[in-house]
């Protein structure tokens, strides 16, 4: 049987049954999520569920820049350190950097400090790049 690889929207990249869009636009976390949703196809800020997925994403983003943190779909909506993925994925894989999780930092970003392989919490109203994801 011939299995056709699903195609992603122009400018998005494909990895293991998902499409990813890296947006170098400056948005706060909630606006970034809204913008992801506006692209349709069930897109949300990206969930990152394995080291392999994290590595693929990190390699792609490093081709554009290596200094700006990037919003992902992990947040702490109740502000109780109960983190969850906005797309409903199970919060099993974790890749937090050793930084403190304190303060008013309830949204997660891929940190540029470790080539985008680890996450940091940040204030959700900060404007920065973001990564969207959907399953085609």
């Amino acid at each position: 049987d011939i299995i056709m690889r699903p195609s992603c929207a122009p400018g998005w990249f494909y990895h293991k049954s998902n499409c990813y869009g890296y947006f170098r636009k400056l948005r706060n976390w909630s606006d970034a999520e809204l913008e992801c949703q506006s692209y349709g196809n069930g897109a949300h800020l990206a969930s990152i569920l394995s080291l392999k997925e994290a590595s693929t994403i990190a390699e792609y983003i490093s081709g554009y820049q290596r200094s700006q943190p990037i919003w992902i779909g992990l947040h702490d909506p109740q502000k109780r350190q109960q983190w969850q993925w906005i797309d409903g994925a199970m919060y099993l894989y974790r890749s937090w950097s050793g930084k403190s999780m304190g303060g008013n930092k309830h949204c997660a970003e891929m940190s540029s400090n470790n080539n985008f392989l680890t996450w940091s919490s940040n204030e959700c109203n900060k404007r920065q790049h973001f990564l969207c994801k959907y399953r085609p």
């Epitope: 947006f23 606006d31 913008e35 506006s38 554009y64 200094s67 404007r127």
Partner: antibody
Framework: EVQLLESGGGLVQPGGSLRLSCAAS????????MSWVRQAPGKGLEWVSA????????YYADSVKGRFTISRDNSKNTLYLQMNSLRAEDTAVYYC????????????WGRGTMVTVSS | DIQLTQSPSSLSASVGDKVTIACRPS??????LAWYQQKPGKPPRLLIY???TLESGVPSRFSGSGSGTYFTLTISSLQPEDFATYYC?????????FGQGTRLEIK
């Protein structure tokens, strides 16, 4: 072909109001964030305001925050800028610009409409 | 806000010349830099984005390079239609900002 056509400019007294419109065609309007950028006579470019494709998110330069309101009507493919409490320093050509899909830069621009604030 | 300082402010050159315009951000930015061309009475036109990516339809004599706090726009062989004002723009930090412009005139 992408086209952006501004209208609504003119002469207004300080403290007055004006509403600019930008009619868009040649692309799926609701899929793109849009922006207003202005240029005072003989001066450089200054970003003024932006709005997401859905209209749910808006952004403003500090110089116009609280005085200007950006909005859009996706059913009419039209972008608006409501300008209140106008000042002499708001005198400029106002350009409607489409924000690039991946970056906060401007890939298409209208021809501009002149706003003059003077008594 | 990130300030962008362009140099020179104005430049006289002849058809066929190679010219370079510099743009210096007040703090380091990533690849989030664009260049625009503007002719009198016309809107700006996007030339280059992400430092060095040519916008569709822009002649290959235009090129961009740089990183951090120093970026350049180079025109390898000036054509009559290239005489205009050029602006850099950063979209690395909010709000987006423009340089003050470089006016390129015929010598």
């Amino acid at each position: 072909e992408v086209q952006l056509l501004e209208s609504g400019g003119g002469l207004v007294q300080p403290g007055g109001s004006l509403r600019l419109s930008c009619a868009a065609s040649g692309f799926t309007f609701s899929s793109y964030a849009m922006s207003w950028v202005r240029q005072a006579p003989g001066k450089g470019l200054e970003w003024v305001s932006a709005i997401s494709g859905s209209g749910g998110s808006t952004y403003y330069a500090d110089s116009v925050k609280g005085r200007f309101t950006i909005s859009r009507d996706n059913s009419k493919n039209t972008l608006y800028l409501q300008m209140n409490s106008l000042r002499a320093e708001d005198t400029a050509v106002y350009y409607c610009a489409r924000i690039h899909n991946w970056n906060d830069m401007f890939d298409y621009w209208g021809r501009g409409t002149m706003v003059t604030v003077s008594s | 806000d990130i300030q962008l300082t362009q140099s020179p402010s104005s430049l006289s050159a002849s058809v066929g010349d190679k010219v370079t315009i510099a743009c210096r951000p007040s703090q380091g930015i990533s690849s989030a830099l664009a260049w625009y061309q503007q002719k009198p009475g016309k809107p700006p036109r996007l030339l280059i984005y992400d430092v060095s990516t040519l916008e569709s339809g822009v002649p290959s004599r235009f090129s961009g390079s740089g990183s951090g706090t120093y970026f350049t726009l180079t025109i390898s062989s000036l054509q009559p239609e290239d005489f205009a004002t050029y602006y850099c723009q950063q979209f690395d930090n909010y709000p987006v900002t423009f340089g003050q412009g470089t006016r390129l005139e015929i010598k």
